[in-house]
C-alpha cells in the first residue's frame, strides 16, 4: 500500500532504535571516510525530521522518497569533493541516478586502518558511560569497512556485542570473558560479510533471476517438505529483501525482512517443522535464527527425479510452455533431495540440464538425446567431492596455519601478478575453510566448503577488478558466479609469469616482529612465503618447506636471544643466503 510519507512509515514500522541504527549504517556505507561524529549528527537530523513526519505526514518534504532525503543529506556535507573526489559528482544527478552513482562509488577495500579492539577495561568504561554511543561506533566502524554488510544482520551482531559487554564488564576478569566471545562474533560477522557481498555481486552482475535461482536451491534444501509454490513465494520475498539491502534501501530491507520472518512463523505448517525455536525469539534473533535454521527432515517417499524430468513424454512440451517455471521445478526437486550438495553445484546441474534441453528439444528425437542427462551430471558432482576430500585430508594433516600456507603457495603459482597482501588475505580466508567445514559430518562438508570458497573467491574477484593484473584471475572472474570456484581450482602455474628478482630486503626482519601478536607474526611469515614463490614459481614443496622451517627457526632463536637486535642483524643475512641457496 502507498504511504503519504515513506519516512514516517518506516520509522513507525522499525521503531526509533532500529531506524537510527539503519540510517547510521546507510550513511557509513555510502561515505566511508566520514567520522562517527559527522554521521551521528546527520542521523540525529534525519531522525528528528522523521518524527515531524510521524506527527504530520503532510509536513514539508515528508512526501519525498528516502533516496531523495538521504541523498540530499549526504550532498550537503561540507568538503565533499576534497574528501571524496569524484563521488561529489553524484550530487549533480537526479534520483534514481544519484543513488546508483553512490552505489558505484562504494569501496570494497577502503584504505582504513584495521578495526582495533580497545583493551577490556577501556572498552567497559566507555560502554558503561554511554552504551548507545558505544554501539553507534561499532555500527559505524563495521559498516564503513564492509559497505555491503547485510544491515539488519549487522544490527543483530551489535545486539550480540551489547549482550557480551553487559555480561563480561560485570566480571572480575573482563579480558578472559570478553576475548573469546568477541572473537567468535567477529569471525561470524566476517563470514556474514563475504556471504552477503556474494549475494550482492550475484544481483549486480546477473540480475534478480540469478539470485532467485540461488534462493530456490537454498530454500528447497532447508525446507524439503514445502511445496514449490511456497518455495517460490519465499524465494521471491527473499530476493526483494536482498535487492533492497544491496541497493542501499536499508530501511525497506529491514522492514521487509521482519515481514518475511513474521510470514514464516505464521506459516510453519507449510514450511518446516524446525522453525518453532527461532519463532520464539525477539525480532533480530528470530530473523538471524531463521536464516541458518537446520534442514527439515526430507520426505521419505520422494519419487526418483528421472520420472518428471527425463522419462516423462512431456519434457520438451513442459519446457517450451514455461521455461523458467519448468527449470525452477527441476532445481526445487533436485535441491530438496540433496541437502548434501552445495548451492553452487545444484545451480551448475540446473544449468547443465537447461543446456541439455536447449540442445535436445531442438532435435528430431529429443528423448533419445536427453535420456542420459542424469548420468552426465556425474563428473560435475565428483569434481567438488574430490576437492573436499583432498583439501580436508590436507587440512587434517597440516592444521590451519600449514593449510593456509599450502593454499598460499598454490594460489601464488596460479596468479603471481596479484599483490602479496591480497594473496595472503585470500589464502588465510580460504584456509579457514578447514576449521569451519572439515570438522563437520560428511554430508555437510561439501555445501560448507564450496559455498564458503565461492564467497571468498568473489572477494578476490572484486579486489582484482579494481586493479586487474592477472589474465588467469580475469578469466575466472569473468564467467558466471557458479563456475568461478571450479575455474580457480583448475588453474595451474602461470607459465607467462616472469619471476621477480630476489630482493634481500623483502626477507630482512627486525626484532619488532617478536612482540607482534601471533596472527601478525603469521602474516609476516606468509608474506615472505608468497614473495619466495614469486621469486621461484616452480620451487618444489620440499624446497619451500626447508626455507620456511629455517625461517621459523631463525625467528624463534633471535626472539629468545638476550640481544635480539644483534641476532637479527647478524643472523638475518645468513638466513637470506641460505634461502637463495636452497631455492637455486
Amino acid at each position: 500500500e502507498a504511504h503519504k510519507s515513506e519516512i514516517a512509515h518506516r520509522y513507525n514500522d522499525l521503531g526509533e532504535q532500529h531506524f537510527k541504527g539503519l540510517v547510521l549504517i546507510a550513511f557509513s556505507q555510502y561515505l566511508q571516510k566520514c567520522s562517527y561524529d559527522e554521521h551521528a549528527k546527520l542521523v540525529q537530523e534525519v531522525t528528528d525530521f522523521a518524527k515531524t513526519c510521524v506527527a504530520d505526514e503532510s509536513a514539508a518534504n515528508c512526501d519525498k522518497s528516502l533516496h531523495t532525503l538521504f541523498g540530499d543529506k549526504l550532498c550537503a556535507i561540507p568538503n565533499l569533493r576534497e574528501n571524496y573526489g569524484e563521488l561529489a559528482d553524484c550530487c549533480t544527478k537526479q534520483e534514481p541516478e544519484r543513488n546508483e552513482c553512490f552505489l558505484q562509488h562504494k569501496d570494497d577495500n577502503p584504505s582504513l586502518p584495521p578495526f582495533e579492539r580497545p583493551e577490556a577495561e577501556a572498552m567497559c568504561t566507555s560502554f558503561k558511560e554511554n552504551p548507545t554511543t558505544f554501539m553507534g561506533h561499532y555500527l559505524h566502524e563495521v559498516a564503513r569497512r564492509h559497505p555491503y554488510f547485510y544491515a539488519p544482520e549487522l544490527l543483530y551482531y551489535a545486539e550480540q556485542y551489547n549482550e557480551i559487554l553487559t555480561q563480561c564488564c560485570a566480571e572480575a576478569d573482563k579480558e578472559s570473558c570478553l576475548t573469546p566471545k568477541l572473537d567468535g562474533v567477529k569471525e561470524k560477522a566476517l563470514v556474514s560479510s563475504v556471504r552477503q557481498r556474494m549475494k550482492c555481486s550475484s544481483m549486480q552482475k546477473f540480475g534478480e533471476r540469478a539470485f532467485k535461482a540461488w534462493a530456490v536451491a537454498r530454500l528447497s534444501q532447508t525446507f524439503p517438505n514445502a511445496d514449490f509454490a511456497e518455495i517460490t513465494k519465499l524465494a521471491t520475498d527473499l530476493t526483494k529483501v536482498n535487492k533492497e539491502c544491496c541497493h542501499g534501501d536499508l530501511l525497506e530491507c529491514a522492514d521487509d525482512r521482519a515481514e518475511l520472518a513474521k510470514y514464516m512463523c505464521e506459516n510453519q505448517a507449510t514450511i518446516s517443522s524446525k522453525l518453532q525455536t527461532c519463532c520464539d525469539k525477539p525480532l533480530l534473533k528470530k530473523a538471524h535464527c531463521l536464516s541458518e535454521v537446520e534442514h527439515d527432515t526430507m520426505p521419505a517417499d520422494l519419487p526418483a527425479i528421472a520420472a518428471d524430468f527425463v522419462e516423462d513424454q512431456e519434457v520438451c512440451k513442459n519446457y517450451a510452455e514455461a521455461k523458467d517455471v519448468f527449470l525452477g521445478t527441476f532445481l526445487y526437486e533436485y535441491s530438496r533431495r540433496h541437502p548434501d550438495y552445495s548451492v553452487s553445484l545444484l545451480l551448475r546441474l540446473a544449468k547443465k540440464y537447461e543446456a541439455t534441453l536447449e540442445k535436445c528439444c531442438a532435435e528430431a528425437n529429443p528423448p533419445a538425446c536427453y535420456g542420459t542427462v542424469l548420468a552426465e551430471f556425474q563428473p560435475l558432482v565428483e569434481e567438488p567431492k574430490n576437492l573436499v576430500k583432498t583439501n580436508c585430508d590436507l587440512y587434517e594433516k597440516l592444521g590451519e596455519y600449514g593449510f593456509q600456507n599450502a593454499i598460499l603457495v598454490r594460489y601464488t603459482q596460479k596468479a603471481p601478478q596479484v599483490s602479496t597482501p591480497t594473496l595472503v588475505e585470500a589464502a588465510r580466508n580460504l584456509g579457514r575453510v578447514g576449521t569451519k567445514c572439515c570438522t563437520l559430518p560428511e554430508d555437510q562438508r561439501l555445501p560448507c566448503v564450496e559455498d564458503y570458497l565461492s564467497a571468498i573467491l568473489n572477494r578476490v574477484c572484486l579486489l582484482h577488478e579494481k586493479t586487474p593484473v592477472s589474465e588467469h584471475v580475469t578469466k575466472c572472474c569473468s564467467g558466471s558466479l557458479v563456475e568461478r570456484r571450479p575455474c580457480f581450482s583448475a588453474l595451474t602455474v602461470d607459465e607467462t609469469y616472469v619471476p621477480k628478482e630476489f630482493k634481500a630486503e623483502t626477507f630482512t626482519f627486525h626484532s619488532d616482529i617478536c612482540t607482534l601478536p601471533e596472527k601478525e607474526k603469521q602474516i609476516k611469515k606468509q608474506t615472505a612465503l608468497a614473495e619466495l614463490v614469486k621469486h621461484k614459481p616452480k620451487a618444489t614443496a620440499e624446497q619451500l618447506k626447508t626455507v620456511m622451517d629455517d625461517f621459523a627457526q631463525f625467528l624463534d632463536t633471535c626472539c629468545k636471544a638476550a640481544d635480539k637486535d644483534t641476532c637479527f642483524s647478524t643472523e638475518g643475512p645468513n638466513l637470506v643466503t641460505r634461502c637463495k641457496d636452497a631455492l637455486a
Partner: nanobody, 115 residues
C-alpha cells in the same frame, strides 16, 4: 502458453494426397523439435514423424516412410506434413506435438481415407 492448431484434414480416396499444417504460438518454435502423432478410432496414439528445430533432421515411422514428408517454416512458426499415396489404415486424427512427446494438447485434424 503453448498453442498448436492443426488444419488440412479431410476425406480423401486411397492413393490421394493431403497436406496438413500446424500453426504454433506461445514459445520459441525454432528451438524445439516437432512431431506428428496420430490416433485411429479406438486405438492408442502412434508416432508418425519428427523434425529437428532447424529442419535439417527428420525421422519417420516405418509405416509411412517414403509416402509422408515432414517439413517446417520457422519464419511462419508452422509445421507441415505432406501425405501422399494415402491408405485406409492412415485414417486417424492427426496431432502435432512438441519435442517428441505423444501428448495431445490440441484438437487435431481428422484424416479419412475411404473410397
Amino acid at each position: 502458453e503453448v498453442q498448436l492448431l492443426e488444419s488440412g484434414g479431410g476425406l480423401v480416396q486411397p492413393g490421394g494426397s493431403l497436406r496438413l499444417s500446424c500453426a504454433a504460438s506461445g514459445f520459441t518454435f525454432r528451438s524445439f523439435g516437432a512431431s506428428w502423432v496420430r490416433q485411429a478410432p479406438g486405438k492408442g496414439p502412434e508416432w508418425v514423424s519428427s523434425i529437428s528445430g532447424s529442419g535439417s533432421d527428420t525421422l519417420y515411422a516405418d509405416s509411412v516412410k517414403g509416402r509422408f514428408t515432414i517439413s517446417r517454416d520457422n519464419s511462419k512458426n508452422t509445421l507441415y506434413l505432406q501425405m501422399n499415396s494415402l491408405r485406409p489404415e492412415d485414417t486417424a486424427v492427426y496431432y502435432c506435438t512438441i519435442g517428441g512427446s505423444l501428448s495431445r494438447s490440441s484438437q487435431g485434424t481428422l484424416v479419412t481415407v475411404s473410397s
